[in-house]
């Protein structure tokens, strides 16, 4: 039975998800849509993604590992609207790792999820990036320019932002 196998598939997906996230918050996105769109309960949601601000201070590599354990990645920012949503939940006196790095120090920036790096959709502070040895990107607040990106040394502990796709149940 098609409906039965669909239900079984949905429940097993839910069980797998709840190994990492014991509680979900779900929203009805439209009147005729049967599925709920869900994020883990402490996470926030924007469009088709869920976001979590990790306040523990860790290196870029450990921050990415922390996100991946939760089924997420360090955040990949695709639009100005997405960044405007994210910054509502950040503290001005903190810096947060993004899922953006330049492993070879050659200014070949790459996103953790292989999204192509598009120079036209970047939000670097003026004068940044400015150091070939600073191979990881953060987002932080500067009074002159508000929120923007900066390159820093990857081993310096920072807070971070995780992003994952919503689950539909």
């Amino acid at each position: 039975n098609f409906m039965y196998s669909k239900t079984v598939k949905r429940l097993s997906k839910l069980r797998e998800y709840q190994q990492y996230h014991p509680s979900l918050t779900c929203v009805m996105e439209g009147k005729d849509i049967e599925d709920w769109s869900c994020c883990p309960t402490p996470w926030t949601s924007f469009q088709s993604s869920c976001y979590f601000i990790s306040t523990g201070m860790q290196s870029w590599t450990k921050s990415q590992k922390n996100c991946s354990v939760m089924g997420a990645d360090l955040v990949v920012i695709n639009t100005r609207e997405e960044q405007d949503f994210i910054i509502q939940n950040l503290k001005r006196n903190s810096s947060y790792f993004l899922g953006l790095s330049d492993p070879g120090g050659r200014r070949h920036w790459q996103w953790v999820d292989q999204t192509p790096y598009n120079e036209n959709v970047t939000f670097w502070h003026s004068g940044e990036p400015n150091n070939l040895d600073e191979r990881c990107a953060i987002i932080n607040f500067r009074s002159s320019e508000e929120w923007g990106w900066n390159d820093i040394h990857c081993h310096v502990p920072q807070k971070s932002i995780c992003k994952m796709k919503k689950i539909y149940i």
């Epitope: 709840q18 049967e34 599925d35 309960t41």
Partner: nanobody
């Protein structure tokens, strides 16, 4: 026979808060999803929020997410709806509902209803 009894409604100013309670009698409560609906005179009853039997899944309609919080206490057979930042458009009769399943789809209809409690938000 399961009975659902709402309380906590009233008149509140826009921007204010209210907490609705729904006490359930009978054995349905602990293994059923529970929810809240609301109805404005002359309109159909609409879903507001629901909670799975063990509180692991919280369900909301988009217009209340971030303002309303649903919770339950299985020891007290009670489900709550904490409403904050209330708006004039939240004015309605609020109904407690019990489902015949532990989790729900957006299309799942409740099997039990309370009598309703009036919430009026003045602007």
């Amino acid at each position: 026979q399961v009975q659902l009894q709402e309380s906590g409604g009233g008149l509140v100013q826009a921007g204010g808060s209210l907490r609705l309670s729904c006490a359930a009698s009978g054995r349905i409560f602990s293994n059923s999803a529970m929810g809240w609906f609301r109805q404005v005179l002359g309109k159909e009853r609409e879903f507001v929020a629901a909670i799975s039997e063990n509180s692991s899944i919280l369900y909301y309609t988009a217009s209340v997410k971030g303002r309303f919080t649903i919770s339950r206490d299985n020891d007290k057979n009670t489900v709550y709806l904490q409403m904050t930042s209330l708006k004039a458009e939240d004015t309605a009769v609020y109904y407690c509902a019990g489902y015949g399943s532990t989790t729900i789809r957006t299309t799942t209809r409740p099997t039990k209803w309370g009598q309703g409690t009036q919430v009026t938000v003045s602007s």
